[in-house]
């Protein structure tokens, strides 16, 4: 998979969206690689 | 409100050395990769390099590499582009941006900066 | 380094026309792909990411498509403050490339 900081971000972003946001507050992109996903 | 706010226009002469600042509001500046982009007269964006704020990481254009340094100072919220040796073909508007997911989700641009290489 | 190419380079289209822009990638980047516009003296406008995805407050006019190596930007029914210069990004692969952009004219 895509593991450029802008494919992190994105995919957090989505991971995020299906959550509802109930995600621990230090998952943000600059704390997570691709292999969080 | 997601700002990034950049520092003013340049003139430098071939050779010498320029610090661009971009200057985040609105968010956790931590959070979220910086981009540094450039733009020459009528030419295609160019992509210089990201920072992660957060632990001051960084990926390069092989282009730049050597010659670009990005930092971070994490107290003020604010980014730094440094640009070495400069040429006449590095006359260009350079940008910061980011992409943040709160509080809105978009991929936030600076205003520009102008930085013109003449001697 | 992963070459963008953007066709065409410019278009003269009128208002209410439906216009097409296409991004081609010299090699595969999945949907890894955005959009941006910009106006003479702006910044760039972020339209698209993930190749067909609208960023909040985009117009629905906006619509892109594509995945591997062909990718496209479709305006449904140009409005006047579509005229501008449109540019695809690659973000799969660093350095992350931009194509050359096309200017959509007046016709």
């Known amino acids: 998979a895509c593991d450029t900081a802008t494919c992190v971000t994105h995919r957090l972003a989505g991971l995020l969206s299906r959550s509802g946001g109930v995600v621990k507050n230090n998952f943000v992109p600059t704390n997570v690689g691709s292999k969080a996903f | 409100e997601v700002q990034l706010v950049q520092s003013g226009a340049e003139v430098k002469k071939p050779g010498a050395s320029v610090k661009v600042s971009c200057k985040a509001s609105?968010?956790?500046?931590?959070?979220?990769?910086m981009n540094w982009v450039r733009q020459a007269p009528g030419q295609r964006l160019e992509w210089i390099g990201d920072?992660?704020?957060?632990?001051?990481?960084?990926n390069y254009n092989q282009k730049f590499k050597g010659r670009a340094t990005l930092t971070v100072d994490k107290s003020a919220s604010t980014a730094y582009m440094e640009l070495s040796s400069l040429r006449s073909e590095d006359t260009a508007v350079y940008y910061c941006a980011s992409i943040i997911i709160v509080p809105n989700y978009f991929d936030y641009w600076g205003q520009g900066t102008t930085v013109t290489v003449s001697s | 380094d992963i070459q963008m190419t953007q066709s065409p380079s410019s278009l003269s289209a009128s208002v209410g026309d439906r216009v097409t822009i296409t991004c081609k990638a010299s090699q595969n980047v999945d949907t890894n792909v955005a959009w941006f516009q910009q106006k003479p003296g702006k910044s760039p406008k972020a339209l698209i990411y993930?190749?067909?995805y609208r960023y909040s407050g985009v117009p629905s006019r906006f619509s892109g498509s594509g995945s591997g190596t062909d990718f496209t930007l479709t305006i449904s029914s140009l409005q006047p403050e579509d005229f501008a210069t449109y540019y695809c990004q690659q973000y799969n692969n660093y350095p992350y490339t931009f194509g050359g952009g096309t200017k959509v004219e007046i016709k």
């Open positions: 920072i992660n704020p957060n632990n001051v990481g960084t």
């Open positions: 609105g968010y956790t500046f931590t959070d979220y990769y």
């Open positions: 993930s190749a067909s």
